[in-house]
């Protein structure tokens, strides 16, 4: 899977969309999870309604909401009041029993609020790395990772 970058401004809302084949994933609930490390597990943040037919109802977990257009085949995640710690790699998933298929890998970038004059030093952007595979960009504001970019901040 390529990684799609979605950029949002700190303090504002960011909407992430994940298109999918509505028939291939018929009847399946969806989820939004956060990748813990480059090879670590994906920790569930929020999932759609327990009843698939009610997947269009928005479900919240803290400041993150999820809603699914099961006929159109678009999963939408809203990150409200975006904060620097929200930056990182996520996945949109389609759930089947104990299994989860990745619909899209998403890198969330948090940009400094241009009207906020506080220190933006804690805002994180991906660094350079020759090892990261190709990625695809789509604007929401969103883009794909450039070749060589890494989706995780360097560890000290």
């Amino acid at each position: 899977h390529n990684t799609t970058v979605f950029q949002g401004v700190a303090g504002q809302s960011l909407q992430v969309s994940c298109p999918y084949d509505s028939m291939k994933h018929w009847g399946r609930r969806k989820a939004w999870c956060r990748q813990l490390g480059e090879k670590g597990p994906c920790q569930r943040v929020v999932s759609t309604h327990n009843l698939w037919l009610l997947s269009f109802l928005r479900r919240w977990n803290g400041s993150t909401a999820i809603t699914d257009d099961t006929l159109g085949g678009t999963l939408t995640i809203t990150l409200r009041n975006l904060q620097p710690h929200d930056a990182g790699l996520y996945q949109c998933q389609s759930l089947h029993g104990s299994e989860a298929d990745t619909l899209r890998k998403v890198l969330v970038e948090v940009l400094a609020d241009p009207l906020d004059h506080r220190d933006a030093g804690d805002l994180w952007f991906p660094g350079e790395s020759e090892s990261f595979e190709d990625a695809h960009v789509e604007h929401s504001i969103s883009r794909s990772l450039l070749e060589g970019e890494i989706p995780f901040p360097p560890t000290s």
Epitope: D21, M23, K24, H25, W26, G27, R28, R29, L51, W52, L53, S94, L95, H96, G97, S98, E99
Partner: antibody, heavy 122, light 108 residues
Framework: EVQLVQSGAEVKKPGESLKISCKGS????????IGWVRQMPGKGLEWMGI????????RYSPSFQGQVTISADKSISTAYLQWSSLKASDTAMYYC???????????????WGQGTTVTVSS | EIVMTQSPGTLSLSPGERATLSCRAS???????LAWYQQKPGQAPRLLIY???SRATGIPDRFSGSGSGTDFTLTISRLEPEDFAVYYC?????????FGGGTKVEIK
């Protein structure tokens, strides 16, 4: 009428290749998963793998991974099961089946082909 | 992989009697991802139950499924002559979507 029609019985020698088919009709072939199931003589059902003809996404049982290839040609609404080198132990009845569209994503196989008998003998 | 164990291997009953077939999974099957099939000699299997308890289209209401976790049951309330066949359970919780070994329901 929704149906899956499989190709006819095959008699082959060990080491030969084979490709059997499963043609769907009466429904949108590209939008349902198609599974393959083996039944050896006098034995039970064994799940081999599944394919989504819309994009050819395929999942195999570890027992059959590398032993067979599952494919599909959506332009002619047909799924395939093939072997590059048959063994006597491949002698069995092979069924294709459609996974229904159910709330919850259940893969209950609601439409079955009539089965293809494959006999491998020297 | 999840191993499905069916019992008994053979069930000898008379028409009109109640049949209770058991299927046990080696690991918990989430959200009741379990199906039941009927197979008669020389025929392809037929889907009876999906989601542990939902009857497939056209299946008579004498067939019912129940259970969760690792233990599932198929019940035929009153056996009809056409119900004597082999029954298989299958989990579709986790690939590979394994079948049980089958239970043969025969006429006593």
């Amino acid at each position: 009428e929704v149906q899956l029609v499989q190709s006819g019985a095959e008699v082959k020698k060990p080491g030969e290749s084979l490709k059997i088919s499963c043609k769907g009709s009466g429904y949108s072939f590209t939008t349902y998963w198609i599974g393959w199931v083996r039944q050896m003589p006098g034995k039970g059902l064994e799940w081999m793998g599944i394919i989504y003809p819309g994009d050819s996404d395929t999942r195999y049982s570890p027992s059959f991974q590398g032993q067979v290839t599952i494919s599909a040609d959506k332009s002619i609404s047909t799924a395939y099961l093939q072997w590059s080198s048959l063994k006597a132990s491949d002698t069995a009845m092979y069924y294709c089946a459609r996974a229904g569209h159910y709330d919850g994503g259940h893969l209950g196989m609601d439409v079955w082909g009539q089965g293809t008998t494959v006999t491998v003998s020297s | 992989e999840i191993v499905m164990t069916q019992s008994p291997g053979t069930l000898s009953l008379s028409p009109g009697e109640r049949a209770t077939l058991s299927c046990r999974a080696s690991q918990s099957v989430s959200s009741s991802y379990l199906a039941w099939y009927q197979q008669k000699p020389g025929q392809a299997p037929r889907l009876l139950i999906y989601g542990a308890s939902s009857r497939a289209t056209g299946i008579p209401d004498r067939f019912s499924g129940s259970g969760s976790g690792t233990d599932f049951t198929l019940t035929i309330s009153r056996l009809e002559p056409e119900d004597f066949a082999v029954y298989y359970c299958q989990q579709d919780d986790r690939s590979p979507y394994t079948f049980g070994g089958g239970t043969k329901v025969e006429i006593k």
